[in-house]
Interface confidence: low
């Protein structure tokens, strides 16, 4: 799975969308989980309504909400009052029995503000960085890792936007 990057501003809300094949995942509940380490488990944050037909109803766990458009095939997660510690790697999952299929891997980046105060020379554009070769950026521009910085998750150094 490619990793999709979503960037949000601290204190504001961030919406994450996970498209899927509505026929293939017909009748399945969905979940949003946080990846604990590169090879660690994905810890459940919130899941859709116990009754699949009511999946359109928004369910909250703390500041995180989930809602599922089962006909259109789009799972939407809302992170309200985004905080720096919300940054990290997450997954949208489709549940069947005790199993879970990954719909999308998501990297959440929390920006103190939409632009960094570093030089514009730190910017990179998709396709110009090997460090992000398995990630594409939604509505944002990020920068590659600094030398020596750990590559997991492939997070940018905070803030470039548009």
């Amino acid at each position: 799975h490619n990793t999709t990057v979503f960037q949000g501003v601290a204190g504001q809300s961030l919406q994450v969308s996970c498209p899927y094949d509505s026929m293939k995942h017909w009748g399945r509940r969905k979940a949003w989980c946080r990846q604990l380490g590169e090879k660690g488990p994905c810890q459940r944050v919130v899941s859709t309504h116990n009754l699949w037909l009511l999946s359109f109803l928004r369910r909250w766990n703390g500041s995180t909400a989930i809602t599922d458009d089962t006909l259109g095939g789009t799972l939407t997660i809302t992170l309200r009052n985004l905080q720096p510690h919300d940054a990290g790697l997450y997954q949208c999952q489709s549940l069947h029995g005790s199993e879970a299929d990954t719909l999308r891997k998501v990297l959440v980046e929390v920006l103190a503000d939409p632009l960094d105060h570093r030089d514009a020379g730190d910017l990179w554009f998709p396709g110009e960085s090997e460090s992000f070769e398995d990630a594409h950026v939604e509505h944002s521009i990020s920068r590659s890792l600094l030398e020596g910085e750990i590559p997991f998750p492939p997070t940018s150094h905070h803030h470039h936007h548009h």
Epitope: Q12, G88, D113, P114, H117
Partner: antibody
Framework: EVQLQESGPELVKPGASVKMSCKAS????????MHWVKQSHGKSLEWIGY????????GYNQKFKGKATLTVNKSSSTAYMELRSLTSEDSAVYYC?????????WGQGTLVTVSA | DIVMTQSTSSLTVTAGEKVTMSCKSS????????????LTWYQQKPGQPPKLLIY???SRESGVPDRFTGRGSGTDFTLTISSVQAEDLAVYYC?????????FGSGTKLEIK
Amino acid sequence: EVQLQESGPELVKPGASVKMSCKASGYTFTDYNMHWVKQSHGKSLEWIGYIYPNNGGTGYNQKFKGKATLTVNKSSSTAYMELRSLTSEDSAVYYCARSGRGFAYWGQGTLVTVSA
Amino acid sequence: DIVMTQSTSSLTVTAGEKVTMSCKSSQSLLNSGNQKNYLTWYQQKPGQPPKLLIYWASSRESGVPDRFTGRGSGTDFTLTISSVQAEDLAVYYCQNDYSYPFTFGSGTKLEIK
């Protein structure tokens, strides 16, 4: 060059209000949060809150809710902080600071003295 | 709120000496998602606003001399000045940059003999 120019010192009476300003230059004002920090004489720093000039969104330290109100004027690239119902406890230097990875840019500070 | 504790309020050293000051947070500042510690160090000289020295616990701000080094993870952090210069006379503050409300330590005043 990024600069934050704060308004001059204020001498105010207890119970009154004061509104200070922070004029930003050298960058796109609407692209960065502006934070406000209090420093009482000889004391540490206290984070008051921030405003996102692009949409006026704010976040406050619970301690300063009802005391401080943050606003901006986008056309003049100026952030404002109003303090109300002033007491001697509010006597301090107030800084505006532009955020990023930490607060890399600070205003010179506005000294507020509350005295009868 | 996260409480930041700088247990040493003042340190007196001779120019050229190495000095280390500590900062403890009441909860971890480590983001498990990106393995960064949201801890910032500032230097404040008399009559001036604070100056950013270190962000993410160990990343030196542009233009800051390399004699300043930040270390630590989780709840325990240090700022080391490898060879103190006369111009380093200042108060040093650590700050929780992890969650709102941002909070600062009480500061460590560095004095030169």
